[in-house]
């Protein structure tokens, strides 16, 4: 069964800077990745970035840099200040779509006891939805 993992890290140098990494553990080819915060996209979450493997990347503030790391994983750097700044308990969600086979989404947030700049290696997060 395909799974999605999400890792959130706060940068030690800039406390308002977050790095979100997401990956797809499955055999299907990815047609689109959507990253949101505040909950799943379409369920109250706000889209931060959308990545297409061939057509490009779209991103919105406070997203600073979204990129593909591998064919099945992406990373997103967030920088914010004031109202647009993420906080330590912000939830980030990643949805990997393989059209028309299905889509898989998982969410994560900064580990409550983690020091800035430190985090555990990525582990599969619960699948919230598999269409």
């Amino acid at each position: 069964t395909p799974e999605v993992w999400v890792q959130v890290r706060m940068e030690a140098t800039e406390l308002s800077s977050f790095t979100i990494r997401c990956g797809f553990l499955g055999s299907g080819s990815i047609s689109l990745v959507t990253v949101s915060w505040g909950g799943p996209n379409g369920a109250g979450g706000t889209t931060l970035a959308v990545l297409h493997p061939e057509r490009g990347i779209r991103q919105w503030a406070p997203a600073r840099q979204a990129r593909w790391e591998t064919q099945s994983s992406i990373s997103l750097i967030l920088e914010g200040s004031g109202a647009s700044s993420p906080c330590a308990n912000t939830t980030f969600c990643c949805k990997f779509a393989s059209f028309p086979e299905g889509s898989w989404e998982a969410c994560g947030s900064l580990p409550p006891s983690s020091d800035p700049g430190l985090s555990a290696p990525p582990t599969p997060a619960p699948i919230l939805r598999a269409d």
């Epitope: 996209n41 889209t47 057509r55 490009g56 779209r58």
Partner: nanobody
Framework: EVQLVESGGGLVQPGGSLRLSCAAS????????MGWFRQAPGKGLDEGVA????????KYADSVKGRFTISRDNAKNSLYLQMNSLRAEDTAVYYC??????????????WGQGTQVTVSS
């Protein structure tokens, strides 16, 4: 939960017409386009057969221009595809999808289960 439900498919003779409907519910979509996509038996997925973006710009695949018409009813949260002068090569599973525009193409982020359209005499 996201739900896009297609209806209106079926068996029709060449030259006939069908109207596909897609009802969206259970979510507020944050993308910027919706459209109809199709997958013919034993073939790959077609690029958007007909798509419409948030500004109302409509795009059709060359193979359906002049025969298919896409429309939407925002009040009913619905998308439609009127298909006229159907041909055997239009036989496929048709998917309603909502997505994001990249380079003028609508890329699906959410979609329904699909509805079968068969054109045969």
């Amino acid at each position: 939960e996201v739900q896009l439900v297609e209806s209106g498919g079926g068996l029709v003779q060449p030259g006939g017409s069908l109207r596909l409907s897609c009802a969206a519910s259970g979510f507020t979509f944050s993308g910027d386009c919706m459209g109809w996509f199709r997958q013919a038996p034993g073939k790959g997925l077609d690029e958007g057969v007909a798509t419409i973006d948030n500004a109302g710009r409509i795009k059709y695949a060359d193979s359906v221009k002049g025969r298919f018409t896409i429309s939407r009813d925002n009040a009913k949260n619905s998308l439609y595809l009127q298909m006229n002068s159907l041909r055997a090569e239009d036989t496929a599973v048709y998917y309603c999808a909502a997505g994001w525009t990249f380079g003028g193409q609508c890329s699906p982020a959410d979609w329904g289960q699909g509805t079968q359209v068969t054109v045969s005499s």
